[in-house]
Interface confidence: low
């Protein structure tokens, strides 16, 4: 015998309370495949999350982040605070890149300048907090006295890579450090 629920298309659920009639998903819920016995609650984009794609009866909503934050994680499960170029996010907020490192984006960590001498090249343009050095021809290709050697990049300070970053995700935009996961979303009910 064919399961009567298999006839229920996406956007509906097989309602056991009504003789397995295919009922439309209630507001703020969806089913992306046919034959479902329940509809899933739509993802909601609150706080620093912004709706990129509205929920429909057949597909979940998609979120991105409000200005000043960027997405992290699968499906933008977290929003991380932007920093300026030349900075990285630490647990004390945005901090300037230390000497010998740079970051040319609003996210991520400061990375050491390229060591031109490792490739047998010289520094053509000095590095800054925002930009890597530009390596030029090798010293041998230059006339005597014209060579320039970059000092080796300093070792990164221990613990200066991203620590306890300002991540904000959906579950509980509700205490003290802003480090939240999406785990309990399915518990939220419309009331």
């Amino acid at each position: 015998l064919q399961d009567p629920c298999s006839n229920c298309p996406a956007g509906t659920f097989c309602d056991n309370n009504r003789n397995q009639i295919c009922s439309p998903c209630p507001p703020n819920s969806f089913s992306s495949a046919g034959g479902q016995r329940t509809c899933d609650i739509c993802r909601q984009c609150k706080g620093v999350f912004r709706t990129r794609k509205e929920c429909s009866s057949t597909s979940n909503a998609e979120c991105d982040c409000t200005p000043g934050f960027h997405c992290l994680g699968a499906g933008c499960s977290m929003c991380e605070q932007d920093c300026k170029q030349g900075q990285e996010l630490t647990k004390k907020g945005c901090k300037d890149c230390c000497f010998g490192t740079f970051n040319d984006q609003k996210r991520g960590i400061c990375r050491p300048w390229t060591n031109c001498s490792l490739d047998g090249k010289s520094v053509l343009v000095n590095g800054t907090k925002e930009r890597d050095v530009v390596c030029g021809p090798s010293p041998a290709d230059l006339s005597p006295g014209a060579s320039s050697v970059t000092p080796p990049a300093p070792a990164r300070e221990p613990g200066h890579s991203p620590q306890e970053q300002k991540l904000i995700s959906e579950e509980d935009l509700g205490g003290e450090q802003k480090l939240i996961s999406e785990e309990d979303l399915h518990h939220h009910h419309h009331h």
């Epitope: 739509c42 909601q44 609150k46 205490g175 802003k178 939240i180 785990e183 309990d184 009910h189 419309h190």
Partner: antibody, heavy 125, light 108 residues
């Protein structure tokens, strides 16, 4: 009827401990995030602590962190606040409050939509 | 943390008056702003959520408006039961949940 009822308040000496309870009725307690909010005599509202519906995520105000512990027992429809190392400045009416979630057309809003009647904690020698 | 500042701290008005209370956030909170009413010896009661949405059971003489950093709660025609303290609360960036310091509405 949707209701929250607190208990456990009383007079305690500085450095002492108390455990507040909040019992829910009229709604599916395990589906809701919960908060404790307090109000010192003649003062405004101050958020104290938060717990997610499953109890996996917890937050505290800086003024109580390390001294207070929030917990919940969904089977008993109960929320708790364990208060240690109490100080005179913890004297207040303590309210438990349900965090209601409201689906807007685009966003997901929340507000403290159900409050208990409050229980009074007095810290004095 | 986001700071919420209400004004005035207290105000006197008469039954039938139109009353406006303002709340300012220290940074933009979009429309993530709630208003509560508290009567002496009682728990706070949610009046308005999402800046302008009236909570179920709240009389229509209450209304909220605003977005970003500036919000208002308006009571169009004051009734005797409306004399109370009113609090705004942001729900944009939490924790912590932060409230305004309150506005006490008294009978003139």
């Amino acid at each position: 009827e949707v209701q929250l009822v607190e208990s456990g308040g009383g007079l305690v000496q500085p450095g002492g401990s108390l455990r507040l309870s909040c019992v829910a009725s009229g709604f599916t307690f395990s589906s809701y995030e919960m908060n404790w909010v307090r109000q010192a005599p003649g003062k405004g509202l101050e958020w104290v602590s938060y717990i997610s519906n499953s109890g996996t995520t917890i937050y505290y105000a800086g003024s109580v962190k390390g001294r207070f512990t929030i917990s919940r027992d969904n089977a008993k429809k109960s929320l708790y606040l364990h208060m240690n190392s109490l100080r005179a400045e913890d004297t207040a009416v303590y309210y438990c409050a349900r965090e209601g979630t409201i689906f807007g057309t685009v966003h997901y809003y929340f507000a403290l939509d159900v409050w208990g009647q409050g229980t009074t904690v007095t810290v004095s020698s | 943390d986001i700071q919420m500042t209400q004004s005035p701290s207290s105000l006197s008005a008469s039954v039938g008056d139109r009353v406006t209370i303002t709340c300012r956030a220290s940074q933009s909170i979009s429309s993530y702003l709630n208003w509560y009413q508290q009567k002496p010896g009682k728990a706070p009661k949610l009046l308005i959520y999402a800046a302008s949405s009236l909570q179920s059971g709240v009389p229509s003489r209450f209304s909220g408006s605003g977005s970003g950093t500036d919000f208002t709660l308006t009571i169009s025609s004051l009734q005797p039961e409306d004399f109370a303290t009113y609090y705004c609360q942001q729900s944009y960036s939490t924790p912590p949940i932060t409230f305004g310091q309150g506005t006490r509405l008294e009978i003139k």
